[in-house]
Interface confidence: medium
Amino acid sequence: NQDLPVIKCVLINHKNNDSSVGKSSSYPMVSESPEDLGCALRPQSSGTVYEAAAVEVDVSASITLQVLVDAPGNISCLWVFKHSSLNCQPHFDLQNRGVVSMVILKMTETQAGEYLLFIQSEATNYTILFTVSIRNTLLYTLRRPYFRKMENQDALVCISESVPEPIVEWVLCDSQGESCKEESPAVVKKEEKVLHELFGTDIRCCARNELGRECTRLFTIDLNQTPQTTLPQLFLKVGEPLWIRCKAVHVNHGFGLTWELENKALEEGNYFEMSTYSTNRTMIRILFAFVSSVARNDTGYYTCSSSKHPSQSALVTIVEKGFINATNSSEDYEIDQYEEFCFSVRFKAYPQIRCTWTFSRKSFPCEQKGLDNGYSISKFCNHKHQPGEYIFHAENDDAQFTKMFTLNIRRKPQVLAEASASQASCFSDGYPLPSWTWKKCSDKSPNCTEEITEGVWNRKANRKVFGQWVSSSTLNMSEAIKGFLVKCCAYNSLGTSCETILLNSPGPFPFIQDNIS
C-alpha cells in the first residue's frame, strides 16, 4: 500500500451570487471553507476505488467537487457521469499536489447522480466515486411555535415541530408600539426554549431553520393600557393550544384577576397566576388562560376582570381550517405620471399569510400591517410608475389567494416607426390608447396636412406586455405615396406625437420624430 497515493476529496459550496463560479479559470474562487468528504478505499472492489462521503445539495445551489492527489509525477484524468465522458484538466497547487475539480452550477435533478473520476498517475490507476443528490427539502417543515406550561413550574416552553430541528428564541420587549420593532434596542433575545420572566410587555417566540423564521406572539390583554376601540380577536384552529395573558399593575397587592368565558368562570386547571413587585414597588399580576387543545366550544368572549381596573375582553374564534378572506376581483387604476399611488389589499387571514407582489415576472417583498378592526393590509408603492399588470399572491397552510391589479399611466403617446418594402408601421404605448392619423408630405402639402385614409389599418392593443397595451397603425404602400415622406401621428387627451417616414429607399428608413404637445 506504500505506493498508493494520498488522496483528499473536498466539497466547496458556492454562494449563489458568487460570480466567480464557472468562469474560465479551472480553479473557481472558494466561497466557503471546503468540507472534507473523507475519501476512503472501498473494500472488496476490483481495482483501487476510493469513495467520497455522499453529497446533498440544495436545488439551484452551486458546488465544486475537488480531489487533491499527493502523488509523484504527472497525472491524467477523466470524469464520467451517466455514461458520458467529461473533460478533465488537472493542475498543481502550491504544495505540488494534483488538483482536479468538477463545477456543478445551479444544481438540478438532472445533475444528481454518480460522478466517477478516473485518475492515471505514473505509479498507478485508481477511481474516485462521488454520489451527489438533491437535498429533499420537501420533507422540510417550519411550523409556527406554540406554548406549553412547564410541568410544576411557572414558566412557558416554546415548541416548534419543524424539520430540521429549529433554533428557538424568545423575543422580549418592555416598551410600547414602534420601539418593539425587531431591531430596536428595547428588544432582548434569548436563545432558549423555556421562559421564566413572563411579566414583560411584549413576548414572542420565534423558531428558525433552513426554511426561514416563524414567530408567535403571546396574546396579551393589559388592563392598564387604553384598549383598542374594538374587541381584539384571536383565531385558532381546532386542536391548537390557546394562551391569553391578562396583565395588571396596581399600587399595592390588594387586587385580584379573574378570567370568564361568556360570563362563566374558567375551570380550575385552565388558568394560572403569577405576581411580582416592580422596581417602584407596585404590584404586577398576570393571569394566564389556557386550553391545551381547543375545540369549537372554546369559541367566545374571554373577559379578564380586576377589582381595581376596567375589565377587557377578547373574542376567540375557533375554525376548522385556516382561511384568507379578501375580495379577489381585479382592480384597474389610472394615474398621472407623477401621482403618488399605492396598491393595497385588505384581508383577514389565519394563520398569518406569506405574500408577494409580482410585476413583470419579478417578485417584490410584501409587508403586512394589522388594522384596528381585525383586518390586515398589504400595500405596494414601488411600481415606479410602470404601467402593467401587478399581482398580489398570499398563502398560508390552508389557503391561497391571488388578486390582479392593472396600472395605467396617463401620458402622451410616444411613437416608434418601422418600415418594409410594402408597408410602414407606427407603434405607441400612450394612455388613454391613442387614435391615429397618416399624412402625406408633398409639394402641394409641405406641412404634411394631406390626410391619407386609403390602406390604413389600425390595431388597438395588439401586444400585451405584462398588462401594458400597445397600439399600432400600419400603412400599406401604394404607388400614390411611394417616394414621399409620410407622417403618422398618435394623439390622445394628453397630446400628440408624430414620426415622419421616407417611403422610397430600400434598407433602413430614416425616421424623424416630431412631438407636438
Epitope: Q225, Q228, T229, T230, S307, K308, S311, N373
Partner: antibody
C-alpha cells in the same frame, strides 16, 4: 345609582386655561373608562378623548393633542379635563361620559349634566 | 378619521306616525368579529345625550321598543315605529370602530 356630577359654568379669556371636573358615584370608579365630549352652541357632538381611571392612561383626539390634559383622583372618584390656550371657538358645553365595562367597546351609558365654558375677551 | 353623515338634517313628524333616520360612514364599521360598531344617541332639548342603540341594532336597557336600528357596513338606519311627543330632540349616530370616535351631524326630530 350611577351619577356623574360636573363642576359649574366658567367664563375665560382667550389664551387662558380651564379645568372642568366630573365626580363619579354609584359604581366602582376604577372599573369604567371616562370620556370627554363637547358641544359648541347649536352644533353637534365632538369626542375629545378618554382616561382609564385605574392607570391614568389617556387617549386624545388629534384636534386636541397638546392642548388637553385629562387626569383623575381615585381618592375622590373624580376626573378632570384641562384645556389650555383657549380661543373663542372653544366656547361649548363639555360633557363627561362613562363607557361600559368589558373594556374595548366604547358606548356611553351615563353622561354628566354638562359644563358650559365661555371664552370671551 | 371616519366621517359620519346623517340625513335628513331636520325631520318634522306626526305623533303616531313612523320615522326613519339614515347614517352613512366613510368606511365600513363591520368588525371581523361580526359586530357593526355604530351607536345611536338622543339629545332631548336642554338635556345630556342618552344611549338608545349600540352595535347597530341592540336596544339599550330601558329604551322603548318602538326604537330599532338596522344596517351593516357603511349604511345604517334608526327607525321609530310610532313617534311620541317625548321623542323630540336631536338624534346622533356615532362610530366606535376606531379612535377618534366620531359623531354624525345630527337629525332634529320635531312635531309637525
Amino acid at each position: 345609582q350611577v351619577q356623574l356630577v360636573q363642576s359649574g359654568a366658567e367664563v375665560k379669556k382667550p389664551g387662558a386655561s380651564v379645568k372642568v371636573s366630573c365626580k363619579a358615584s354609584g359604581y366602582t370608579f376604577t372599573s369604567y373608562y371616562m370620556h370627554w365630549v363637547r358641544q359648541a352652541p347649536g352644533q353637534g357632538l365632538e369626542w375629545m378623548g378618554l382616561i382609564n381611571p385605574s392607570s391614568g392612561s389617556t387617549s386624545y383626539a388629534r384636534n386636541f393633542q397638546g392642548r388637553v390634559t385629562m387626569t383623575r383622583d381615585t381618592s375622590t372618584s373624580t376626573v378632570y379635563m384641562e384645556l389650555s390656550s383657549l380661543r373663542s371657538e372653544d366656547t361649548a358645553v363639555y360633557y363627561c361620559a362613562r363607557s361600559g365595562s368589558g373594556g374595548s367597546y366604547f358606548l356611553f351609558d351615563y353622561w354628566g349634566q354638562g359644563t358650559l365654558v365661555t371664552v370671551s375677551s | 378619521d371616519i366621517v359620519m353623515t346623517q340625513s335628513p338634517l331636520s325631520l318634522p313628524v306626526t305623533p303616531g306616525e313612523p320615522a326613519s333616520i339614515s347614517c352613512r360612514s366613510s368606511q365600513s364599521l363591520l368588525h371581523s368579529n361580526g359586530y357593526n360598531y355604530l351607536d345611536w344617541y338622543l339629545q332631548k332639548p336642554g338635556q345630556s345625550p342618552q344611549l338608545l342603540i349600540y352595535a347597530a341594532s341592540t336596544l339599550q336597557s330601558g329604551v322603548p321598543d318602538r326604537f330599532s336600528g338596522s344596517g351593516s357596513g357603511t349604511d345604517f338606519t334608526l327607525k321609530i315605529s310610532r313617534v311620541e311627543a317625548e321623542d323630540v330632540g336631536v338624534y346622533y349616530c356615532m362610530q366606535a370602530l376606531q379612535t377618534p370616535l366620531t359623531f354624525g351631524g345630527g337629525t332634529k326630530v320635531e312635531i309637525k
